[in-house]
């Protein structure tokens, strides 16, 4: 946020930034909370806007038992490890073919015991103010699909008649991490020591954080023909005086007649 | 990447007999798995003989006692020995191999293919 300043009083007005504003030989530019000429207004709006999507990652484990393990599988430059990521990739694809937010998965480790795959389970969603539930779900169908496929896709005879087999007792589910998103969070940081005076409010689904001078939310606070502006002791509303009237209360609602006053007369409206 | 090219193939009577072979280039024969598929009119792709670098081999129910998976390292080849050909028999025969172990009968684990050799069994 910036404003330019032309003229002879340009000079002392480099000196007289505030809020860590620095002169750029025009102008004080001004750090992200702060705007004006000299950086001395608080802004009414931060943009925290939300990331576009929200991810997860389930940490899995499951035994495959129609690949026999070789040592080169252990190696992830390896063909061997090549080709069982391919398999395993289109496998899971499969399985997971009917969740929305599924993305894919990682291959983390191979190791002995048949093939014990220890990969992650990527999913995404859009964000909503809803994102965890709609994860939370989407973690929970995961949990049922390998379940489910890991139970029938077992080897008969030492044969396996599907793309890949299963350990039925070899699946777990290790971990699950979800990016945390707070908005409530965000907005108070940024606000720094004007936190406490910031809040989130949604429209179409997306968080705005803005303070009580932002107009059109249901915190904002109507200064009438004041205007707002913020302090370290919260949002105040500084009247203005015309030519026929002067405006004082906390909201610059009542008005004085210039001309009763120099006639001694008060009148409210 | 590992080529296959399958020969061997031709018209046939039935009881006759025929010997199919998968040339493969690369280094990769003597590790994984190799087989050979058929895959007859209308029909989907199903596994007919399977051998595996540590020795196992696997014979569809209607081959077994009739056909032979064998393969030459020094040459790189697989083959496949028919006796007793029957008219069941008549599809395209393919070559498939992974350097995987497997133990799986579904086209969809094996990672390289040959082109096919078809094979008729008619009087």
């Known amino acids: 946020r910036t404003t330019t300043c032309f003229g002879d009083g340009c000079q002392n007005t480099a000196s007289r930034c505030k809020n860590g504003g620095t002169w750029d030989g025009l102008k004080c530019q001004c750090p992200n909370l702060y705007y004006g000429e000299l950086c001395e207004e608080v802004v009414s709006s931060i943009d925290i806007g939300p990331p576009e999507t929200i991810s997860a990652q389930m940490e899995l484990t499951v035994t495959v038992t129609s690949v026999k393990f070789t040592e080169e599988l252990k190696n992830h430059s390896s063909q061997e490890f090549q080709e069982f990521k391919q398999t395993f990739t289109e496998q899971m694809n499969i399985v997971y073919s009917g969740i929305p937010e599924y993305v894919g998965v990682n291959i983390t480790k191979l190791r002995l015991g048949s093939v014990v795959v220890e990969h992650d389970v990527l999913l995404r969603t859009k964000y909503t103010p809803e994102y965890k539930t709609v994860l939370d779900n989407a973690t929970e169908v995961v949990k049922e699909k390998i379940t489910k496929v890991t139970t029938q896709q077992i080897m008969i005879n030492d044969i396996c008649s599907d793309m890949m087999c299963f350990n039925t007792t070899g699946t777990q589910v290790q971990n699950i991490t979800v990016t945390q998103y707070d908005p409530e969070e965000d907005c108070r940081k940024m606000a720094k020591e004007y936190g406490d005076y910031f809040v989130v409010e949604y429209r179409d689904q997306k968080p705005y954080c803005i303070s009580p001078c932002e107009p059109g939310f249901s915190v904002s606070k109507n200064c009438n023909l004041g205007k707002c502006q913020m302090s370290l002791s919260g949002p105040q509303c500084l009247c203005v005086t015309t030519e026929t009237h002067w405006y004082s209360g906390e909201t610059c609602n009542q008005g004085t007649q210039k001309s009763l006053v120099y006639g001694h007369h008060h009148h409210h409206h | 990447e590992v080529q296959l090219v399958e020969s061997g193939g031709g018209v046939v009577q039935p009881g006759g007999s025929l010997r199919l072979s998968c040339a493969a280039s690369?280094?990769?024969?003597?590790?994984?798995?190799w087989g050979w598929f058929r895959q007859a009119p209308g029909k989907e792709r199903e596994a007919v003989a399977l051998?595996?670098?540590?020795?196992?081999?696997f014979y569809a129910d209607s081959v077994k006692g009739r056909f032979t998976i064998s393969q030459d390292n020094t040459k790189n080849t697989l083959y496949l020995q028919m006796n007793s050909l029957r008219a069941e028999d008549t599809a395209v025969y393919y070559c498939?191999?992974?350097?995987?172990?497997?133990?799986?009968?579904?086209?969809?684990?094996?990672?390289?293919w040959g082109q096919g050799t078809m094979v008729t069994v008619s009087s």
């Open positions: 498939a191999a992974s350097v995987l172990v497997l133990r799986t009968l579904n086209p969809k684990a094996w990672h390289h």
């Open positions: 690369g280094d990769t024969f003597s590790r994984g798995s």
């Open positions: 051998i595996s670098s540590d020795g196992w081999t």
